[in-house]
């Protein structure tokens, strides 16, 4: 009998709302085993896999996507979705990226922290494994 | 399918140096982390390093064995992973398998394996 | 670093009888434990991950079970393609640590 799957989250670092140029990562969360993890924009066909995947606590397991630089091509919705063999999951909540200009520059401290969407919310870092984030992707169409 | 061969194994003296590579296929090379995984005449398997992808700065782990002398690298350009051994010890001799991982941290693909001997 | 305990480190076993090799961490793994068979001559080959799930291609009559700090691999049946030295290895934490080994003899 397959199990059923957990939704996974989705949360952004630093936040949701982020300076033109600045970076973000978004961090998928799903329960041990998973294979892959996939970010996905409004279009499922626009995503980026990755199979760096971290051990985040007893009971999960994340991955990482980060945008170097972001530019207004970046801003909208994103989700998480994972295969965890033999299936799919289902799909994370949206969670929306905002770009906005700023006369700070790349550092100024005007990011909205810790935002997230998704039924799990936990610190995204087990220091005990050493395992810290998680990876790049395959594209359909380029992400980032 | 996927492939992982490994190359530029040999005969070394005690403190001396070689770099191991591992050339990838089948597979997308760039969105899984590496490892390169040993094992000893008549001996078991021993874990040497890892190496993260891009979105995690190429992350580095090493057993402490290996510490300060092994470099782990790799070129997403050219699907290669490379292992720089320096100051080698006659006890880092044997097979060197180049890995890639699944789940985080379970070794699912494994290559033929490369023989590094250090002996004066 | 996390020690992982093969208690045997060889077994002399009848074909069909079923086997059944432990292996016990150190501390808690939260069932990051894999299992991997390696024939002789040959490279090592993932069986199981996640202390339960068997990879793709793995015959139904190897299973995993244990949580915490103690895990099994079973065979129900042994088959002569079976003889191998049995490793199992914990990924919950850098440095990964694998066991010493059981290798299964015919007797």
């Known amino acids: 009998q397959e199990e059923d799957l957990p939704r996974p989250s989705i949360s952004a670092e630093p936040g949701t709302v982020i300076p033109l140029g600045s970076h973000v990562t978004f961090v998928c969360r799903g329960p041990v085993g998973v294979q892959t993890f996939r970010l996905e924009r409004e279009s499922r066909s626009t995503y980026n896999d990755t199979e760096d995947v971290s051990q985040a606590s007893p009971s999960e397991s994340e991955a990482r996507f980060r945008i170097d630089s972001v530019s207004e091509g970046n801003a909208g919705p994103y989700r998480c979705i994972y295969y965890k063999p033999p299936k799919w999951s289902e799909q994370s909540d949206y969670l929306e990226l905002l770009v906005k200009e700023t006369s700070g520059g790349p550092d100024s401290p005007d990011t909205e922290p810790g935002s997230s969407a998704g039924p799990t919310q936990r610190p995204s870092d087990n220091s005990h494994n050493e395992h810290a984030p998680a990876s790049q992707g395959l594209k359909a169409e380029h992400l980032y | 399918e996927v492939q992982l061969v490994e190359t530029g194994g040999g005969l070394v003296q005690p403190k001396g140096s070689l770099k191991l590579s591992c050339a990838a296929s089948?597979?997308?090379?760039?969105?899984?982390?590496m490892n390169w995984v040993r094992q000893a005449p008549g001996k078991g398997l021993e874990w040497v390093a890892r190496i993260r992808t891009k979105n995690n700065n190429y992350a580095t782990y090493y057993a402490d064995s290996v510490k300060d002398r092994f470099t782990i690298s790799r070129d997403d350009s050219e699907s290669m992973l490379y292992l720089q051994m320096n100051n080698l010890k006659t006890e880092d001799t044997a097979m060197y398998y180049c890995v890639r991982d699944r789940y985080g941290g379970a070794m699912a693909y494994w290559g033929q394996g490369t023989s590094v001997t250090v002996s004066s | 670093d996390i020690q992982m305990t093969q208690s045997s480190s060889s077994f002399s076993v009848s074909l069909g009888d079923r086997v059944t090799i432990t292996c016990k961490a150190s501390e808690d793994i939260y069932n990051r434990l894999a299992w991997y068979q390696q024939k002789p001559g040959n490279v090592p080959r993932l069986l199981i991950s996640s202390a339960t799930s068997l990879e793709t291609g793995v015959p139904s009559r190897f299973s995993g079970s244990g949580s915490g700090k103690d895990y099994t691999l079973s065979l129900t049946s042994l088959q002569s393609e079976d003889v191998a030295t049995y490793y199992c290895?914990?990924?919950?934490?850098?440095?990964?640590?694998f066991g010493g080994g059981t290798k299964l003899e015919i007797k």
């Open positions: 290895q914990q990924y919950w934490t850098i440095p990964y640590t």
């Open positions: 089948g597979f997308t090379f760039n969105i899984n982390a």
